[in-house]
């Protein structure tokens, strides 16, 4: 029997943000091709990214079918069809991914402050409810639709003239905070899922300050 230089994939890594989910692996192929398969614990294996020379595979379409399921993927290595490679029958080389539960593990994307409105000494700050690729009844669900009250937002706000930050929390997408009249404030928000053990927090949103476009002021 002959030999082949086919090598198994390694460093299989899930990269997932707001349920957009890509499996990455190494190495770059030389005289070989890959096929990815994905399954739930109780389901059948489904081939994706078939016969590819890429080292990443977008598995979003599969995981959004049920984001609370736990998924396993495996990457098969095959000798390319133009490679001289003959040996006795043998299963293709493959490597398993770590298990991945989207609901518990997808990273929370950087949130965006949609608007803020001042009325007297109160400011209403609204966080954009980001659309995900999770569908229900043919419509895409928002992050809030998917996570419900599991998702909270933390607001950091401070006077433009000072560095002392205050915080507020909400389990909706809106904050109503007290401010000093005549002062300009800056705002940043962070998405948080307190019940999680990993990937609990997003990165902070871009800072928005009063006196700029997104704001509105009423006496």
């Amino acid at each position: 029997s002959g030999t082949t230089n086919t090598v198994a994939a390694y460093n299989l890594t899930w990269k997932s943000t707001n349920f957009k989910t890509i499996l990455e692996w190494e190495p770059k192929p030389v005289n070989q091709v890959y096929t990815v398969q994905i399954s739930t614990k109780s389901g059948d294996w489904k081939s994706k990214c078939f016969y590819t020379t890429d080292t990443e595979c977008d598995l979003t379409d599969e995981i959004v079918k049920d984001v609370k399921q736990t998924y396993l993927a495996r990457v098969f290595s095959y000798p390319a069809g133009n490679v001289e490679s003959t040996g006795s029958a043998g299963e293709p080389l493959y490597e398993n991914s770590p298990e991945f539960t989207p609901y518990l593990e997808t990273n929370l994307g950087q949130p965006t402050i949609q608007s803020f409105e001042q009325v007297g000494t109160k400011v209403n700050v609204t966080v954009e409810d980001e659309r995900t690729l999770v569908r229900r009844n043919n419509t895409f669900l928002s992050l809030r639709d998917v996570f419900g009250k599991d998702l909270i937002y933390t607001l950091y706000y401070w006077k433009s003239s000072s560095s002392g930050k205050k915080t507020a929390k909400t389990n909706t997408n809106e904050f109503l905070i007290d401010v000093d009249k005549g002062e300009n404030y800056c705002f940043s928000v962070q998405a948080v899922i307190p019940s999680r053990t990993v990937n609990r927090k997003s990165t902070d949103s871009p800072v928005e300050c009063m006196g700029q476009e997104k704001g509105e002021f009423r006496e």
């Epitope: 029997s1 002959g2 082949t4 086919t6 096929t35 059948d44 294996w45 489904k46 081939s47 994706k48 078939f50 016969y51 098969f76 095959y78 000798p79 069809g81 490679v83 001289e84 490679s85 003959t86 040996g87 006795s88 029958a89 043998g90 299963e91 293709p92 080389l93 493959y94």
Partner: nanobody, 114 residues
Framework: QVQLVESGGGLVQPGGSLRLSCTAS????????MGWHRQAPGKGLELVAV???????HYADFVKGRFTISRDNAKNAVYLQMNFLRAEDTAVYYC????????WGQGTMVTVSS
């Protein structure tokens, strides 16, 4: 060693059809890729089409819309339906199964000529 036996080749006129069949001598795992490559006179081996155990397919650009690959896991067989054949499809067509290694049939000749 897995033995692959092809059949169905022959002489056909341009625009005609042929169906190639390939059967393995032993059970082929559903994790194997099966498919077809071809080698035209004086040219190198090139991929035609491949299929996974669960029916996912990949075609070379030059056959898309003309050729259809299918697989019967129970029969350890793979098929290639070739329609709208052209003179440039003339080649030896090799059945292929890939697991840990590549396995090849002996080839079947397809000649497209008027």
């Amino acid at each position: 060693q897995v033995q692959l036996v092809e059949s169905g080749g022959g002489l056909v006129q341009p625009g005609g059809s042929l169906r190639l069949s390939c059967t393995a001598s032993e059970t082929i795992s559903s994790t194997y890729i099966m498919g077809w490559h071809r080698q035209a006179p004086g040219k190198g081996l090139e991929l035609v089409a491949v299929i996974s155990g669960d029916g996912v397919t990949h075609y070379a650009d030059f056959v898309k819309g003309r050729f259809t690959i299918s697989r019967d896991n129970a029969k350890n067989a793979v098929y290639l339906q070739m329609n709208f054949l052209r003179a440039e499809d003339t080649a030896v067509y090799y059945c292929y199964a890939a697991g840990r290694w590549n396995h090849w049939g002996q080839g079947t000749m397809v000649t497209v000529s008027s």
